[in-house]
């Protein structure tokens, strides 16, 4: 059985998806899609997070121990690469 991703009335086969993981345009809210060796990465626009940038970021999540290293994080709000 093929997995099919429905987007804009278009069905995308598993083969197509593996050839171009960004074909289904999975990144929401203006996130940019980049091919990755194990699939794809959504680089989220500022204010969004999640594997597909589907979540709005809410404050206070950064309070953690130990502090995370700085730098761009896929699936998190960031400047476009």
């Amino acid at each position: 059985d093929h997995h099919h991703h429905h987007h804009e009335q278009k069905l995308i086969s598993e083969e197509d998806l593996r050839a171009d993981p960004c074909a289904a345009r999975p990144c929401a809210h203006g996130g940019r899609c980049y091919a990755h060796f194990s699939g794809l990465v959504c680089a989220c626009a500022p204010g969004y997070m999640g594997a597909r940038c589907e979540f709005p970021v809410h404050p206070d999540g950064a309070s953690a121990l130990p502090a995370a290293p700085p730098g761009l994080r896929p699936g998190d709000p960031q400047r476009y690469l």
Epitope: H3, H5, G39, G50, A51, E54, G61, A68, D76
Partner: antibody
Framework: QVQLVQSGAEVKKPGASVKVSCKAS????????VHWVRQAPGQGLEWMVI????????SYAQKFLGRVTMTRDTSTNTVYMELKSLRSEDTAVYYC?????????????????WGQGTTVTVSS | DIQMTQSPSAMSASVGDRVTITCRAS??????LVWFQQKPGKAPKRLIY???SLYSGVPSRFSGSGSGTEFTLTISSLQPEDFATYYC?????????FGQGTKLEIK
């Protein structure tokens, strides 16, 4: 194997706070999102919050904004969910669940591995 | 928020029966639809992701189908261990939402 182990049951008074922990093992902790979902007695499942254990960013369901705080400790691979100003309707089983990989997805699984649940009882 | 409506909310069936549970989304959710099984006192257990893909270890009597806003979970031949409550989950958009559940009881 991939596992999420949660802290034990809690009994709290109205107005108090509760902090529930979820310790991950069997995978790279910072590579997957973690969700919290709750279930009141005899009721359905309710999504609460997601955290990126690597960056610490969070997103809350609207009804929990300001009352739930998520933290994580990357040295012990543990996520914490604190719920403040408890009321009787917060009596529920609280589950953590592993979400999507932060990087590298062909397909999306929603939530694939769940903790055993933590019962929180709010009673005066 | 996207509302997920499951039907029926409860049903009784016998071992060997074919059972279908439906989940309707209030708007299109692409293929971001997951099914879970939950037994009393236990955490939900994953069954199906991406509408129709079985997680490894899930018996082939379980299947999923649908697209857009209407989705179904089918159990082709009920086994005693299948009596449980079933939930759908949309993970297309924030906030994630579950169906209210379908309790499958022994007739």
């Amino acid at each position: 194997q991939v596992q999420l182990v949660q802290s034990g049951a809690e009994v709290k008074k109205p107005g108090a706070s509760v902090k529930v922990s979820c310790k991950a093992s069997g995978y790279t902790f910072t590579s997957y999102y973690v969700h919290w979902v709750r279930q009141a007695p005899g009721q359905g499942l309710e999504w609460m919050v997601i955290i990126n254990p690597g960056g610490g960013t969070t997103s809350y369901a609207q009804k929990f904004l300001g009352r739930v705080t998520m933290t994580r400790d990357t040295s012990t691979n543990t996520v914490y969910m604190e719920l403040k100003s408890l009321r009787s309707e917060d009596t529920a089983v609280y589950y953590c669940a592993r979400g999507e990989a932060v990087t590298g997805n062909y397909f999306y699984y929603g939530m694939d591995v769940w903790g055993q649940g933590t019962t929180v009882t709010v009673s005066s | 928020d996207i509302q997920m409506t499951q039907s029926p909310s409860a049903m009784s069936a016998s071992v060997g029966d074919r059972v279908t549970i439906t989940c309707r989304a209030s708007q299109g959710i692409s293929n971001y639809l997951v099914w879970f099984q939950q037994k009393p006192g236990k955490a939900p257990k994953r069954l199906i992701y991406a509408v129709s893909s079985l997680y490894s270890g899930v018996p082939s009597r379980f299947s999923g189908s649908g697209s857009g806003t209407e989705f179904t979970l089918t159990i082709s031949s009920l086994q005693p261990e299948d009596f449980a409550t079933y939930y759908c989950l949309q993970h297309d958009s924030y906030p994630y939402t579950f169906g209210q559940g379908t309790k499958l009881e022994i007739k």
